[in-house]
Each structure stands twice: as structure tokens, then as C-alpha cells.
């Protein structure tokens, strides 16, 4: 168990005291408080909430709480010139228009400043043309259209259903296919679970509900106008033409009632197979264009949103460490929401608030953590992880020297079935040990550990008797800490049963219907799942900040490195002739992984035996653990993605939300059979194997005895 010399609480009760102080009723109260009005990034309401949180964190007992502001590029609809899509006839008359707003949920009819559904950062434009249905607009969907079906999207408006991959990837794919506009819609197949009523009578998406969201392809850049540097008072800003990641074609989201009207007239090719059919009563024809009687009708988009440099505010709270104040454990989650943020983000922000309160209570009783804990309420996450990224850019020198770990705290729930954890392998053992000590909130697991219910409901595909822990991808505020800076990171939330619920995310994600009542009535009436998530997130922070020896196990990295090397080798072996022709060998990578495994094993043995009372040796061993994640960072970054610098993990180039292992090699191999210059393509594969092998070997050497 944890212990700490700087406390007047009996050491073995430290963690227990912290966990016992966390209360479901408080989380409920905080969630209610945070969700009564919209808190859109860049608005006065969100600034006021930042000041409220600052004030409350001070009251809770943190040593200091500051606002950190930045002036970043945001995007808003034009209040007097609404965005919509129409069907026009041959005379140019609009014979159908999509809705301008979502019908407000009961009790919220008089709330002002509900931003209508829009795709943030869409350029302005009024393209018109034939429609092509592109399924989820994934890379493989465009391959199917262009290569197999010989359907050309050039000059067309494409309509894609939300789900499976990050919406920004959909837009990027559509742009590359030559489309001149994108319509995004929520299909009931993905956002309406069978047997559940739509809101307000259940947690399903009504036909008028629409998912908002940004459509950037930032690849970790942060503010599009100041990549790599903070958007502070003296920042040099790029011109809009040079901004990072902005889409070049108009994009707009709609609900399934409006989608029905567009899709029911579609003609052209039939869907290639059943995986292209959703649940609407339409043929899901691919197009291009409308069927016979309607062939002269076109679709026209009317997009008038504007991009504006706007001030945002992070709240940064500090609880100074008693022994190692220059070692930082960070707990961060965002505060800005698209509308009410009932789940995203306030179910997470309420948990952070309660964790801060519990830590503050212990501090008031005379306790301090061994290491400094930083608490963050990030702004403008919904606009591209901007608040966290700008703060990390501003503080990068401190973070890369002092950052021990980052724990993310966005939505606490996306379901109420079981725990979901994504983290660095360094934290596997921490998560396992912690969840064995926590009680499961699940029905049928009374008196059982969280580890047991989690393992039963979400078993590891590789190791029996263990739960699934996933790779970190992106799409949330840990990105800059993990993918750019190489700070060990993790996230935890309660999730749905992915086996039985095939819909993407949760149905009301980023809609006006994501309210306090959604959570209180349908997801977690007792707030027991929120409490469990608070215990997991808070418990991880507690251990990371308080353990004498950092709770990282480098042997778990060795295990996954071997798994990832095997996986990428098997992908490459789908091209045996080319590997022979171009002398492609993975020997260097497997050798590096073997060395890493042996050195990690020896390091772990030394970790058991060294004299923990010697502060210099203790600090040395902890520094080797802290800097191991950093050792996987390549200062040059990945090809064309300079802010994704982790060699072992990166967000997938085809889906920002998903993590990819050995991403440099993976991307070099991806679709390699379609590269016209195989010599060049296989040369890049060889280069990426070299980079990966070198990085793994270099990381291994950081664990060797120092002299």
C-alpha cells in the first residue's frame, strides 16, 4: 500500500481516507450545477463557469488556482444567416430545406444561446450538385466506391453517416475523393438502440437530434494558427490559408428525419452489400444523383459559419507535493460543451470536482501528496483539444522534465455496463491492483471487486483472467501529453456492452438532448457508476502522486512491444515477394524488443532490491521509470505529423479516435500494393523499421544500470 512521510494520517489509511471521502451525492449535485445552461467554448457563460470552478477549487483547499487564457481560432454559425441544406428543382427553387435547430428538450424551451447544429470550422459556401452516399466515409468505403464500383465523387456532394471513425477523417477522405461538400447524418442503425425510446422517454436519439462536432485534421497541432507554440498575447498567427487542419469544403450535420428526405430519392448504383445499409426506410442507393423522376433535382448546401480568434480559459489548480514538488501528476478534463454537456464533459468535470474536494479535505487535515498534483479544467476541447494543447505548449519545458503522469477526465460514462480503460502499458499493473481494491457497482457483482466484474464483462483478448485495456488513440485532452510529450497517460470511464450495442458512442452524443436528466433518469440514477469512475481516476492519481516508487511496470511494455512487432510483421508478410525483392527485414526490431525485454526484467529485479531509504537512488530509479515513456518520443515526429511523436502509439491515420501501434511502419505498409513506386514505398517501410528498432533499443538503454 502507499505510504508517505509527509502526513499526519496513518499511512495505510491514506488511500482509504481519500476514497471514502468521495460521495455520489456530491457528484450528482456538481453535475446538476454544471449543466443548467450551455457552456460553449469562447462564450461568457463558459468564462463564468471557469471563475466559479476557480473559486470552488480554492475553497476546497488547493494551494493555488489560476486561469490560463489563450486566443485561439474557434468557429460559430452566423446568428442571422443560418446553415441549412436544400433540395432544389431544375428552376433552382428550394423544394425541401433541412431544419435550422433541434427541438429543445422539455424544460429547456426558454434557454438562450443554444448553438444550432453545425460542423465547426466548415468553410462558407453554397455548393450544389448530385449526391453520393459514401457509407461511413472511411478509407475503405472510398476504396469500395472508387476502385470496385468505379464511382467518382469528384464534384459531388457526399452524404456520410456518423460513426465508426472521427468525423474529421470522414471529411478529409471526402476532400481527397474530390467532393465539393459533405453532409453528415446520424443513422438509427448507429444511434438508435433497439427496444429503447427516444429522448425524453429514453436515451435514444430522436429524428430531429443532431450531432455537433469539429471537422479538423489537426494531427495534434492545437490552435490552427499557432502550431507548436502557445496562442498568447504576443503570438505570431498564420494567415487563414496557412492554418493547420482546416477543411476546404463545406460540411453540415443533420438528423435522420432530414436524412430520410435526402436519401429516399437516391438513384444510381445499389449499395454494394448489406454493411452499407442503415435502418432508414430508404434504398441506400449510392448514386450519383437522384432516381428517374427526381433526376433533375440537386442538393444545395448553405453554409455561413465564421472562424474567429476568441479567448479561452483553462483553470489550473495546484496541490504542492511535500517531498517531490517538482514532479507533476496531472488530472485534467474539459469544461466546454456543445450545449448542456450532460455527459460530455460535465459527467467528467463533476467527478474531477469531487476528487479535488476529497484531496482538499485531506490537505486541510494536514496531509500532502508526495508529488505535486495539478488539476485542470480545459477549455475548447470540442474545437480541437485547444485548451490543453496550448497550455502544454506553453509549459512544455516544465512538463517534459517534470511530468510523471496525466490522467484524463472527460465523460465519466458512455454507458453503464462495465469499466473501460485506455492507458500506457506502464499503468496496467496500477489499474489492475487498484480495481482489485475497489467494489464493483454492477448488479450481480455485489461484494465482488471491480476487477472481477470488469474482467468478466470485458475480458482481455490475449490474457485469460484479465480485463481488456485498450491503446490510447486521440480525440481527447491526453493527446498532447502522451502523443507529443511522452508523458505516461491513462483514461477510464464506464461504457456500454459493445457486443450487443453496435451503435457508435452513445446516441445523444453532442446533441441538445445531452442533459442532466438524461444521466439522472436513464444512465446512472444512483450515481454509483460516476462514483466508481471517480474512485478509479482519483485512485490512480493518488497512487501516482503518493507511491514511494512510481507504480509503473516496464515489463508490461516489453510484452506489448513483442505483440505489436508480431502484428506489424504479419501485416508486412502479406507481401512476401516484395519483402524478398527489397530485402525487407524485421530482425532489427525483434532484436531491439528482445533487448528491451531482458533489460526491463533486470530493471524490475533491481527495483525490488534497491535501498528505498536512499533518496538519491530512489529518485534515480523513479526518474528511469518516469522518463521511459519519454524515451519513445522521436523529436522529428511521424511523417507529415510532426506533433505525433510517439513511435509506439499514434492516433490512426484513418480514425483519430483509435490508437495504432508502430504507426510509422503501419502507415508505410498501408495500401502499399497501390503505390505506383514500390521501390520508394518499400524503402519507406525499411526506414520506419529502422526508426522503430532504434527507438525501442534506445528506450531499453534508459533502463540499463546507469554506470
Amino acid at each position: 500500500k502507499s505510504s508517505n512521510e509527509a502526513t499526519n494520517i496513518t499511512p495505510k489509511h491514506n488511500m482509504k481516507a481519500f476514497l471514502d471521502e468521495l460521495k455520489a451525492e456530491n457528484i450528482k449535485k456538481f453535475l446538476y450545477n454544471f449543466t443548467q445552461i450551455p457552456h460553449l467554448a469562447g462564450t461568457e457563460q463558459n468564462f463564468q463557469l471557469a471563475k466559479q470552478i476557480q473559486s470552488q477549487w480554492k475553497e476546497f483547499g488547493l494551494d493555488s488556482v489560476e486561469l490560463a487564457h489563450y486566443d485561439v481560432l474557434l468557429s460559430y454559425p452566423n446568428k442571422t444567416h443560418p446553415n441549412y441544406i436544400s433540395i432544389i428543382n431544375e428552376d433552382g427553387n428550394e423544394i425541401f430545406n433541412t431544419s435550422l435547430f433541434e427541438p429543445p428538450p422539455p424544460g429547456y424551451e426558454n434557454v438562450s444561446d443554444i448553438v444550432p447544429p453545425f460542423s465547426a470550422f466548415s468553410p462558407q459556401g453554397m455548393p450544389e450538385g448530385d449526391l453520393v452516399y459514401v457509407n461511413y466515409a472511411r478509407t475503405e468505403d472510398f476504396f469500395k466506391l472508387e476502385r470496385d464500383m468505379k464511382i467518382n465523387c469528384s464534384g459531388k456532394i457526399v452524404i456520410a453517416r456518423y460513426g465508426k471513425v472521427f468525423r474529421g477523417n470522414k471529411v478529409k477522405n471526402a476532400q481527397l475523393a474530390g467532393a465539393k461538400g459533405v453532409i453528415l447524418y446520424s443513422d438509427p442503425a448507429d444511434y438508435f438502440a433497439p427496444g429503447v425510446k427516444s429522448y425524453p422517454d429514453g436515451w435514444n436519439l430522436p429524428g430531429g437530434g443532431v450531432q455537433r462536432g469539429n471537422i479538423l485534421n489537426l494531427n495534434g497541432a492545437g490552435d490552427p494558427l499557432t502550431p507548436g507554440y502557445p496562442a498568447n498575447e504576443y503570438a505570431y498567427r498564420r494567415g487563414i490559408a496557412e492554418a493547420v487542419g482546416l477543411p476546404s469544403i463545406p460540411v453540415h450535420p443533420i438528423g435522420y428525419y432530414d436524412a430520410q428526405k435526402l436519401l429516399e430519392k437516391m438513384g444510381g448504383s445499389a449499395p454494394p452489400d448489406s454493411s452499407w445499409r442503415g435502418s432508414l426506410k430508404v434504398p441506400y442507393n449510392v448514386g450519383p444523383g437522384f432516381t428517374g423522376n427526381f433526376s433533375t433535382q440537386k442538393v444545395k448546401m448553405h453554409i455561413h459559419s465564421t472562424n474567429e480568434v476568441t479567448r479561452i480559459y483553462n483553470v489550473i489548480g495546484t496541490l504542492r507535493g511535500a517531498v517531490e514538488p517538482d514532479r507533476y501528476v496531472i488530472l485534467g478534463g474539459h469544461r466546454d460543451s456543445w450545449v448542456f454537456g450532460g455527459i460530455d464533459p460535465q459527467s467528467g468535470a463533476a467527478v474531477v470536482h469531487e476528487i479535488v474536494r476529497s484531496f482538499g479535505t485531506l490537505k486541510k487535515e494536514g496531509w500532502r501528496p508526495r508529488r505535486t498534483i495539478l488539476f485542470a479544467s480545459w477549455d475548447a476541447e470540442e474545437f480541437g483539444l485547444l485548451g490543453s494543447t496550448e497550455w502544454a505548449e506553453e509549459n512544455s519545458r516544465l512538463l517534459q522534465e517534470r511530468g510523471v503522469a496525466y490522467i484524463n477526465a472527460d465523460s465519466s460514462i458512455e454507458g453503464n455496463y462495465t469499466l473501460r480503460v485506455d492507458c500506457t502499458p506502464l499503468m496496467y499493473s496500477l489499474v489492475h491492483n487498484l480495481t482489485k481494491e475497489l467494489k464493483s457497482p454492477d448488479e450481480g457483482f455485489e461484494g465482488k471487486s471491480l476487477y472481477e466484474s470488469w474482467t468478466k464483462k470485458s475480458p482481455s483478448p490475449e490474457f485469460s483472467g484479465m480485463p481488456r485495456i485498450s491503446k490510447l488513440g486521440s480525440g481527447n485532452d491526453f493527446e498532447v501529453f502522451f502523443q507529443r510529450l511522452g508523458i505516461a497517460s491513462g483514461r477510464a470511464r464506464y461504457t456500454k456492452n459493445w457486443e450487443t450495442n453496435k451503435f457508435s458512442g452513445y446516441p445523444l452524443y453532442h446533441s441538445v438532448y445531452e442533459t442532466y436528466e438524461l444521466v439522472e433518469k436513464f444512465y446512472d440514477p444512483m450515481f454509483k457508476y460516476h462514483l466508481t469512475v471517480a474512485q478509479v481516476r482519483g485512485g490512480m492519481v493518488f497512487e501516482l502522486a503518493n507511491s514511494i516508487v512510481l507504480p509503473f511496470d516496464c515489463r508490461d511494455y516489453a510484452v506489448v512491444l513483442r505483440k505489436y512487432a508480431d502484428k506489424i510483421y504479419s501485416i508486412s508478410m502479406k507481401h512476401p515477394q516484395e519483402m524478398k525483392t527489397y530485402s525487407v527485414s524485421f530482425d532489427s526490431l525483434f532484436s531491439a524488443v528482445k533487448n528491451f525485454t531482458e533489460i526491463a526484467s533486470k530493471f524490475s529485479e533491481r527495483l525490488q532490491d534497491f535501498d528505498k531509504s536512499n533518496p538519491i537512488v530512489l529518485r534515480m530509479m523513479n526518474d528511469q521509470l518516469m522518463f521511459l515513456e519519454r524515451a519513445f518520443i522521436d523529436p522529428l515526429g511521424l511523417p507529415d505529423r510532426p506533433f505525433y511523436r510517439h513511435v509506439i502509439y499514434a492516433p490512426s491515420s484513418h480514425n483519430k479516435y483509435a490508437g495504432e501501434s508502430f504507426p510509422g511502419i503501419y502507415d508505410a505498409l498501408f495500401d502499399i500494393e497501390s503505390k505506383v513506386d514500390p521501390s520508394k514505398a518499400w524503402g519507406e517501410v525499411k526506414r520506419q523499421i529502422y526508426v522503430a528498432a532504434f527507438t525501442v533499443q534506445a528506450a531499453a538503454e534508459t533502463l540499463s544500470e546507469v554506470a
Epitope: 476502385r147 467518382n152 515477394q577 500494393e673 505506383v676
Partner: antibody, heavy 117, light 108 residues
């Protein structure tokens, strides 16, 4: 390096048949669509036929449709062109070529088919 | 089907000269255009793909440009081994794969 070797060409009378073969090495044959392209004496290049990796998608130029049949055997790294009802205008050098999304990438040295009475 | 028209059909030049061959598509093909070189009795060899990308091993005196419907192949400073026939080919909408009729480059 890559090697594409055609065979089976020769002299045939109008109305006759020939079967061209093509064996490849240096690339993983089963990963690629394949084409036959021909070139009449002192003339330009004319695409004849394409076949997808798993033989599910097959295309022919209008000039040979109904007379020529393309096929492949991935296990043998081989591509075939069965040519029936041959005409004088089918006289050409026939090239087997790897297709990379419409780009005719690696060509064999060609095999000459002469249709003459 | 997309038609490809090359011009000129033949041209004469001397070693060291620079020459330009043009290719026009009957409709926009974005940058999906390839250039091939063919010497007598030999198979065509790919030189340039997607209008301007030089294949590994192809000398840098060869360059391509254009997008949409109009494309050019330029050889800056002819070498003796460059005298051959050059074909353009669209890979935008296939099948059918369509080639230009060829441009024969002779030594003056």
C-alpha cells in the same frame, strides 16, 4: 527485381484460337489486378482486358468482348488470356502488365500474335 | 470513355535540346495521368505517375506537369538514350485504360 514473362504467342489463322500465359515474380501476384495490353505493328497501345485480384471483376475492351477470356491462377502466379475467333486485326504484341489502380505498372517483354491466312 | 490526345505525333530534336510533349484528356482527370517511354522492340516503361511524380530511378531531366485536362512531359537536355516513343495514359476512370496515340521523338 520484378519479372513478367509472357508466352503462347504465334501464327494462327483467322477464326483460330490461342492461349497466352504470363508468369510473374518479384511481387505478390495475388495482391494485384492484372491487365493485358496489346500493340499492333507500328501502332499505339490498346488495353484489352483486366482482372481483379480474386477474379470477381473482369473487364474487356469492346473490340474483344465475347471472344477473349481473361483468367488467373494465384497459386501459380499466372495470368492467362484465352483468345478465340481471332481476326486479322488482333495481330499485335500482347503485353501482360501489373495494374496499380489504373496505372499499368510492370510490363512483360510481350508475345507476338500473328493472325493471317 | 475518356479519350487522350497527344501532340505532336512526332518531333525531331538534338542531344542537349529540351522538348515538351502535351497530352489532352476529353474530360477532367484531376492529376491521374501517367507517362511511358517505349523503345523499339521493348515494352513500355513508366516514367511519371500522377502527372508529376517521377518514378524511382528515372533521371530528373524528365518532368511532368498539369492537371484537369491539359498535361505536359518535358525533357530538359536530351540524352541519346531518350530518343523513343512516349505515351500518356489516364488512370482516373478505369476500365477502360486509355492511352494517347504516342509521340515519336527522333534524333535530328
Amino acid at each position: 527485381e520484378f519479372q513478367v514473362v509472357e508466352s503462347g504467342g504465334g501464327l494462327v489463322k483467322p477464326g483460330g484460337s490461342l492461349r497466352l500465359s504470363c508468369v510473374v515474380s518479384g511481387f505478390t501476384f495475388s495482391n494485384y489486378n492484372m491487365n493485358w495490353v496489346r500493340q499492333a505493328p507500328a501502332k499505339g497501345l490498346e488495353w484489352v482486358s483486366s482482372i481483379s485480384t480474386g477474379s470477381s471483376d473482369i473487364y474487356y475492351a469492346d473490340s474483344v468482348k465475347g471472344r477473349f477470356t481473361i483468367s488467373r491462377d494465384n497459386a501459380k502466379n499466372s495470368l492467362y488470356l484465352q483468345m478465340n475467333s481471332l481476326r486479322v486485326e488482333d495481330t499485335a504484341v500482347y503485353y501482360c502488365a501489373r495494374d496499380i489502380i489504373g496505372t499499368t505498372r510492370d510490363w512483360g517483354q510481350g508475345t507476338l500474335v500473328t493472325v493471317s491466312s | 470513355d475518356i479519350q487522350m490526345t497527344q501532340s505532336p505525333s512526332s518531333l525531331s530534336a538534338s542531344v542537349g535540346d529540351s522538348v515538351t510533349i502535351t497530352c489532352r484528356a476529353s474530360q477532367s482527370i484531376n492529376n491521374y495521368l501517367n507517362w511511358y517511354q517505349q523503345k523499339p522492340g521493348k515494352a513500355p516503361k513508366l516514367l511519371i505517375y500522377t502527372a508529376s511524380s517521377l518514378l524511382s530511378g528515372v533521371p530528373s531531366r524528365f518532368s511532368g506537369s498539369g492537371s484537369g485536362t491539359d498535361f505536359t512531359l518535358t525533357i530538359s537536355g536530351l540524352h541519346p538514350e531518350d530518343f523513343a516513343t512516349y505515351f500518356c495514359q489516364q488512370s482516373f476512370s478505369t476500365p477502360p485504360i486509355t492511352f494517347g496515340q504516342g509521340t515519336r521523338l527522333d534524333i535530328k
